[in-house]
Interface confidence: low
């Protein structure tokens, strides 16, 4: 049978390198041949190229060298396949060379800051050694900043007579450190270079961007006054790298702006002792080249009511993340203040806050928490310059089964009667909520029994059993990973009893 | 650093023919287009002719066309220029000059010493 | 080919002067202009590209300017190390050529 007819041949001129052409050659049971025929210097010549490898994935392409490919030129292209029994010729195929034109990337040989010039960087590069000099070169420069993966692409031409190799990046944030990669192409081609290899640059420092205020207000001590404790951090979005030097703190009662103290600290917290009134609490954080924004929060008086506006709360693991979900019925409360800790019997020392607008629900990767802990979450409704009062709950990022199970006693023995008693495991052993208990009990020789109960109950009577006979029971604490069983015990029923 | 080192000067007859040589380090040979420039006693500077070593494309003065002819042989990073049926007239002092790339393949940034070929009978 | 006409072929200065040479295409080459600078018995050196990118190390008393077909080159303050030959050369395209040169002499 005749050979199939070459179809979707395809060229691309690698600049001062060679044409390759390319093509599909069908399902061909016996050796073929293949010749592509051109016409080149606008039609004046032709010549050919034949395929001489015999393995079928190299018999689809051919190339044509240097030095007979200039540009501008208009080519056609015909793939003819030969085999014993005849020749079949594809579709004559039309190209212009700039449009098939693929050069080497650009090598970009700085990546700066401009002096001066604010959330912008330059780029300067090298054009491909090989490029049309007759032909103008457009580029994609694609950017994203170090710890994130996903790129950002702008798309801009150079006039070829443009000696000026840069481009001014701007709309960055500041002090921050960029990756930039470029590529390029002839203006007329769709053909894009390789990227080039990748450079780093940084943004120029500014003054600190703002700060996010927050505090925890203590019960008040003998002599009426409050420890008021102070956190701060940088706004979301400031850069990464952005240095502090220090922060200035002036506080005042709302009634009486003369009585302002201030400080100075480097730390990130700092614990005020306030008196019982409404005080009003403002910062700045500095660096060399200025103060950041005023970050101002009011501390309502020991005796002020706070509003209560979240009506329920639920958490619940999806995807890899912890989210929390609440119901107002404050419809124009759309700020909220999240706080979180560990629940451990000592002092939280690792308490993070986060504040949300515009919605009523917050979620936290789970690699952000630890895994098998209990988290204390609380919501903040915040209105203005009014805190409401929280919500609390627990919730656990990851739950794991219980590391022991509960610690059982037997009680009240009788004749066919048992109460089982047991203790709720710690709270560092439990790996997750309890949701449940399951009681275990069999006779010596006898079938097993299970009774489950709720995670409220902590005892539980059991019935009808045998008198005068011996039975093994064992309480399981039960997360939604799993059970964890406690250590058995025995005990016998009597063979009588005084109420009989 | 970049440097240019040219062959030692050359005494022919008129007719015969001379290659200069242009050893290039501290560099990408292969990176960069090498000129021929040459200028005569007491004259100015005459551009000859270019080649760009990556693929042997090479580009001349019309008026040498049909005399000069630039090679370059990456192996030693090394670039020739040979002139052949010299005339008195061709006695010059011939220099290889690399392009500064990012300025355009026609800025002369690094020249050889230069390699003085004297013409006479 | 573009021809490069520099004027004047010669001139006479001292320390101190400040000198100004031409240079003028005959056809459009827009800023596609280089300067260099030549002391006898040595290789010329590149001083000013792109009419008026000082090259690597050149003194910021050398500076260019134009663009189009006229174009000069400036010594603020002439230094006695600037007496030399000044040639321009097009960079626009294949072939090149250069100016005739002027000859910066001791006044």
């Known amino acids: 049978a005749l050979p199939a007819k070459p179809e979707n041949i395809s060229c691309v001129y690698y600049y001062r390198k060679n044409l390759t052409c390319t093509w599909s050659p069908g399902k061909e049971t016996s050796y073929t041949q293949y010749t592509v025929k051109r016409t080149y210097a606008f039609g004046e010549k032709h010549d050919n190229c034949t395929t001489n490898s015999s393995t079928s994935e190299n018999r689809a392409s051919c190339s044509f060298f240097l030095p007979r490919i200039t540009i501008p030129d208009n080519y056609t292209i015909e793939v003819e396949a030969e085999n014993g029994d005849g020749v079949i010729k594809s579709h004559m195929t039309y190209w212009r060379l700039e449009n098939i034109a693929k050069t080497e990337p650009p090598k970009i040989f700085r990546v700066k800051p401009v002096l001066g010039i604010k959330r912008m960087i330059q780029i300067e590069w090298i054009k491909p050694e090989l490029a049309p000099v007759s032909s103008d070169l457009k580029y994609t420069l694609r950017f994203r900043t170090v710890n994130s993966t996903s790129w950002m692409e702008v798309n801009f031409a150079k006039n070829r007579k443009d000696k000026n190799q840069t481009y001014n990046l701007t709309g960055l944030q500041p002090f921050t450190e960029y990756v930039i990669a470029l590529r390029c192409a002839v203006k007329e081609s769709k053909f894009w270079s390789d990227w080039s290899q990748e450079k780093m640059g940084m943004t120029e420092e500014e003054a600190p961007c703002g700060l996010e205020l927050w505090r925890v207000l203590k019960p008040a001590e003998a002599d009426g006054r409050r420890p008021v404790r102070l956190l701060w951090k940088k706004a979301r979005g400031a850069p990464v790298l952005e240095k502090t030097l220090g922060y200035n703190i002036w506080y005042y009662p709302e009634s009486n702006t003369n009585l302002t103290e201030t400080m100075n600290t480097t730390n990130q917290q700092l614990e005020l002792h306030l008196g019982g009134e409404s005080f009003w609490v403002s910062m700045i954080s500095y660096n060399s080249l200025g103060k950041s924004p005023v970050a101002t929060l009011r501390i309502p008086a020991i005796q002020e009511k706070s509003f209560q506006c979240i009506e329920v709360m639920q958490a619940c693991v999806a995807e890899d993340q912890l989210v929390v979900k609440w119901q107002s019925s404050a419809l124009d409360v759309n700020t909220w203040m999240i706080e979180w800790f560990p629940d451990v019997d000592s002092e939280p020392t690792t308490l993070s806050w986060e504040s949300v607008s515009q919605a009523t629900n917050w979620t936290i990767q789970q690699d952000k928490l630890k895994p098998f802990w209990c988290y204390n979450i609380s919501v903040y409704p915040m209105l203005h310059d009014k805190v409401g009062e929280p919500y609390s709950i627990q919730a656990y990022a990851k739950e794991g089964v219980p590391s022991e199970g509960p610690e059982t006693k037997v009680e009240n023995i009788g004749v066919k009667t048992v109460t089982i008693t047991w203790k709720e495991i710690p709270k560092s052993e439990r790996k997750g909520i309890i949701c449940n208990y399951t009681i275990f009990y069999q006779a010596e020789g006898g079938k097993g029994f299970s009774k489950t109960v709720n995670s409220s109950i902590l005892q539980y009577g059991l019935e009808s059993l045998k008198r005068k006979t011996s039975y093994i029971v064992q309480v399981m604490a039960s997360t939604s990973a799993g059970g964890t069983n406690g250590t058995s015990i025995n005990f016998k029923t009597l063979s009588f009893s005084v109420f009989e | 650093q970049v440097q240019l080192v040219q062959s030692g000067a050359e005494v022919k007859k008129p007719g015969a023919s001379v290659k200069v040589s242009c050893k290039a380090s501290?560099?990408?040979?292969?990176?960069?287009?090498m000129n021929w420039v040459r200028q005569a006693p007491g004259q100015g500077l005459e551009w000859m002719g270019l080649?760009?070593?990556?693929?042997?494309?090479?580009s001349y003065n019309q008026q040498f066309q049909d005399r000069v002819t630039i090679t370059a042989d990456e192996s030693t990073s090394t670039a020739y220029m040979e002139l052949s049926s010299l005339r008195s007239e061709d006695t010059a002092v011939y220099y290889c000059?690399?392009?500064?790339?990012?300025?355009?393949?026609?800025?002369?940034?690094?020249w050889g010493q230069g390699t003085l070929v004297t013409v006479s009978s | 080919d573009i021809q490069m006409t520099q004027s004047p072929s010669s001139l006479s200065a001292s320390v101190g002067d400040r000198v100004t040479i031409t240079c003028q295409a005959s056809?459009?080459?827009?800023?596609?202009l280089a300067w260099y600078q030549q002391k006898p018995g040595k290789a010329p050196k590149l001083l000013i590209y792109?009419?008026?990118t000082e090259a690597q190390g050149v003194p910021s008393r050398f500076s260019g300017s134009g663009s189009g077909t006229d174009f000069t080159l400036t010594i603020s303050s002439l230094q006695p190390e600037d007496f030399a030959t000044y040639y321009c050369?097009?960079?626009?395209?294949?072939?090149?050529?250069f100016g005739g040169g002027t000859k910066v002499e001791i006044k």
């Open positions: 000059a690399r392009d500064g790339y990012d300025d355009g393949p026609y800025t002369l940034e690094t």
């Open positions: 501290g560099y990408t040979f292969t990176g960069y287009i």
């Open positions: 080649i760009n070593p990556y693929n042997g494309g090479t």
């Open positions: 056809e459009d080459i827009y800023s596609f």
């Open positions: 792109n009419a008026q």
């Open positions: 050369q097009h960079h626009y395209d294949s072939p090149l050529t």
